[in-house]
């Protein structure tokens, strides 16, 4: 850990840039020491913080799971970016499981928008034009292809 | 209402050990992060450690890292602390905290001692 000091006594190693906390603040890639007089920096590939802080210590940084990908990777000043893979996607309700894209669109339908690691497949009615998100009404009581079923765990 | 109740403490052998427990009731215990922190006599509050709301991110500040242990139970509301090694320095009473995040160095300042809460006292001695 670099220790980024208020005392003036003491000599930076040679490329070691300096800083104090600000305004009881330290810098992205930094977090506060427990005496709240340095700013340390974070682990590289480790830790990290992505705005000025007081924290008492360097966010962890994410590791992706089986069934994502690493778009990007931690930097001290940004987390790990995960992406679910290919014929997977990640829903808003459920962020932490990457769910599998349906195969294909019920009967009568067409698909009008491939599965992204964001969504899923869009089907809509051939004649109507209307979305259909494969969940069906309650009233009906046609036989359906299941929706996606969870691949593994996100978290 | 939220409740935290401390147990565990004791009087105990420099390099012994201590296992605190931490019952939550009164809020979605799962949703946030929680701390130990602790007060010695005499002292301040000092920041212990800390663990994420899934328990997977744990921290310590340097003085305990390597000899205390914090973990989470969340289907049974309880936080713990595993502390080994101890050392006369130790020697404090320790509350469990409720936090939306990480710790802050102003937020440990400000932070005070409800009135009712109990802590657990941990006596280091020989």
């Known amino acids: 850990i670099t220790r980024q000091s208020l005392d003036p006594q003491r000599r930076a190693a040679p490329q070691q840039k300096r800083s104090s906390p600000t305004e009881g603040l330290c810098p992205p890639g930094h977090h506060i020491s427990e005496d709240s007089r340095e700013c340390i920096s974070c682990k590289y590939g480790q830790d990290y913080s992505t705005h000025w802080n007081d924290f008492l210590f360097c966010l962890r940084c994410t590791k992706c799971d089986s069934g994502e990908v690493e778009v990007n990777s931690c930097t001290t000043t940004r987390n790990t970016v995960c992406q679910c893979e290919e014929g997977t996607f990640r829903e808003e309700d459920s962020p932490e499981i990457c769910r599998k894209c349906r195969t294909g669109c019920p009967r009568g339908m067409v698909k009008v928008k491939d599965c992204t690691p964001w969504s899923d497949i869009e089907c809509v009615h051939k004649e109507s034009g209307t979305k259909h998100t494969g969940e069906v009404p309650a009233v009906e009581k046609t036989v359906t292809t299941s929706p996606g079923t969870p691949a593994s765990p996100c978290s | 209402e939220v409740q935290l109740v401390e147990s565990g403490g004791g009087l105990v052998q420099p390099g012994g050990s201590l296992r605190l427990s931490c019952a939550a009731s009164?809020?979605?215990?799962?949703r946030y992060w929680m701390y130990w922190v602790r007060q010695a006599p005499g002292k301040g509050l000092e920041w212990?450690?800390?663990?994420?709301?899934?328990?997977?991110?744990?921290y310590y500040r340097d003085s305990v890292r390597g000899r205390f242990t914090i973990s989470r139970d969340n289907f049974k509301n309880t936080l713990y602390l595993q502390m080994n090694s101890l050392k006369s320095e130790d020697t404090a009473v320790y509350y469990c905290?409720?936090?939306?995040?990480?710790?802050?160095?102003?937020?440990?300042?400000?932070?005070?001692?409800?009135?009712g809460a109990q802590g657990t006292q941990v006596t280091v001695s020989s």
């Open positions: 905290a409720k936090a939306e995040g990480p710790p802050t160095f102003s937020l440990i300042r400000t932070m005070t001692v409800d009135p």
């Open positions: 009164g809020f979605t215990f799962s």
């Open positions: 212990v450690s800390a663990i994420n709301s899934g328990g997977g991110d744990t």
